[in-house]
């Protein structure tokens, strides 16, 4: 028997369902009584789900997994993982045994989009050209860690005087805070881009200083 899985990682959003695809080619006359199917975590060998002795043995992994019972006889050994969490990330191995056996591993990459950044300034009033200001860009509840890029109004990257920190929360998601210290010109726009490297999702925030007063662009 030959087992086939996707070579590319499966990307799943936190709190959504994911399908880890695994298939085999059943011989003519194949019946489910002949099938032994085991899904396990590749590295720790922890059992996730199994089908043996002609029946679904159920989930051994936080009761959030399921097979596709009606499709097993056609060679579809895929695993459904419900309400994906950060802790689910990793490699899963699909073992199929009929008369001989084969196995293959598929990787699950978990992701969560970052929120639209909020922008704050310090100081936020009586600003004059030549003043040093601190602009903070904050974006929340993403996974994995974000990349942050700053640009001025002409699109020129701002890399000096930038400090970015990631903060992990109880669910394993990250809040990102990036601080730009800059000397104000007569007027100007400063924008930050928070990128989720897995989703290639960009979240933008910007602040514009046009003499007085200070203005924030409207929400997109």
């Amino acid at each position: 028997v030959e087992v086939q899985v996707s070579e590319d990682p499966v990307v799943a959003l936190v709190d959504t369902d994911a399908t880890l695809r695994c298939s085999f080619s059943p011989e003519p006359g194949f019946s489910l009584a002949q099938l032994n199917l085991i899904w396990q975590l590749t590295d720790t060998k922890q059992l996730v789900h199994s089908f043996t002795e002609g029946r679904d043995q159920g989930s051994a992994y936080s009761n959030r997994t399921a097979l596709f019972p009606d499709l097993l006889v056609q060679g579809n050994a895929s695993l459904r993982l419900q309400r994906v969490r950060v802790t689910d990330e990793g490699s899963y191995t699909c073992f199929v045994s009929i008369q001989d056996f084969d196995s293959a591993a598929v990787s699950l990459q978990v992701a969560a989009p970052y929120s639209k950044p909020s922008m704050t300034l310090e100081p936020n009033k009586d600003l004059r050209p030549g003043n040093m200001v601190t602009i903070t860009c904050s974006s929340y509840q993403g996974y994995p860690e974000a990349e942050v890029f700053w640009k001025d109004g002409q699109g020129v990257p701002l890399t000096g005087n930038v400090t970015t920190s990631q903060m992990a929360n109880e669910r394993g998601l990250f809040d990102v805070h990036s601080v730009l210290r800059v000397v104000l010109g007569a007027n100007g726009t400063y924008s930050c881009l928070v990128r989720n490297p897995v989703l290639q999702q960009d979240a933008h925030g910007s602040v514009t200083i046009t003499g007085q007063p200070l203005t924030f662009p409207p929400e997109a």
Partner: antibody
């Protein structure tokens, strides 16, 4: 059995470059965040850099712009390219595997380390 | 950056005694993201306790951890000869991910 084996350390002059390697085995390397942590002689541990499974990298401020972390998932190998080396970069460099969120991102396996000495 | 200050720097005790090591954070750290490592001379660090109080695989139960907020403690109930080493706390709550300066537990 999980194994991490560093190599590439040595004596280098200030301003010089060096590339460290870390060969990983016994686990699915491509799915883990990997890090470099260093330890100056007689001192404590200092995080240097981390790289996500897909290649996105993060650095400590004191190495940003000089060091580049990378990985080759097909070769199960982690790298650290170190340029513009300074005397204060002298340390044993360890590669470490960051465990998943069920262990709250602790570094559960470490290599034996490779010594980098920056001196004229 | 979160600074972790370990005390004492050196702890001189005899086998069989109880060891209490402290780790103080400059700002609050989620107890989930506070870890402890053990390092013996010439060897790499090894994970001892994760998330303040959970023993890593293969670590004997004479080791325990506690604490919250800014104050964390590692306790070794009865020191065995192999426990004499340097111990580091680490936080993964906020980048840059930082380590304490270490506490050396030496034989009295």
């Amino acid at each position: 059995e999980v194994q991490l084996v560093e190599s590439g350390g040595g004596l280098i002059q200030p301003g010089g470059s060096l590339r460290l390697s870390c060969a990983a085995s016994g686990f699915t390397f491509s799915t883990y965040v990997m890090s470099w942590v260093r330890q100056a002689p007689g001192k404590g541990l200092e995080w240097v850099s981390s790289i996500l499974s897909g290649g996105t990298s993060f650095y400590a401020d004191n190495v940003k712009g000089r060091f580049t972390i990378s990985r080759d998932n097909s070769k199960n190998t982690l790298y650290l390219q170190m340029n513009s080396l300074r005397a204060e970069d002298t340390a044993v460099y360890y590669c470490a595997r960051r465990y998943g969120h069920d262990h709250y991102y602790a570094m559960d396996y470490w290599g034996q380390g490779t010594l980098v000495t920056v001196s004229s | 950056e979160i600074v972790l200050t370990q005390s004492p720097a050196t702890l001189s005790l005899s086998p069989g005694e109880r060891a209490t090591l402290s780790c103080a954070a400059s700002s609050s750290v989620s107890s989930s993201y506070l870890h402890w490592y053990q390092q013996k001379p010439g060897l790499a660090p090894r994970l001892l306790i994760y998330s303040t109080s959970n023993l890593a695989s293969g670590i004997p139960d004479r080791f325990s951890g506690s604490g919250s907020g800014t104050d964390f403690t590692l306790t070794i109930s009865r020191l065995e000869p192999e426990d004499f080493a340097v111990y580091y706390c680490q936080q993964y709550h906020r980048s840059p991910w930082t380590f304490g300066g270490g506490t050396k537990v030496e034989i009295k």
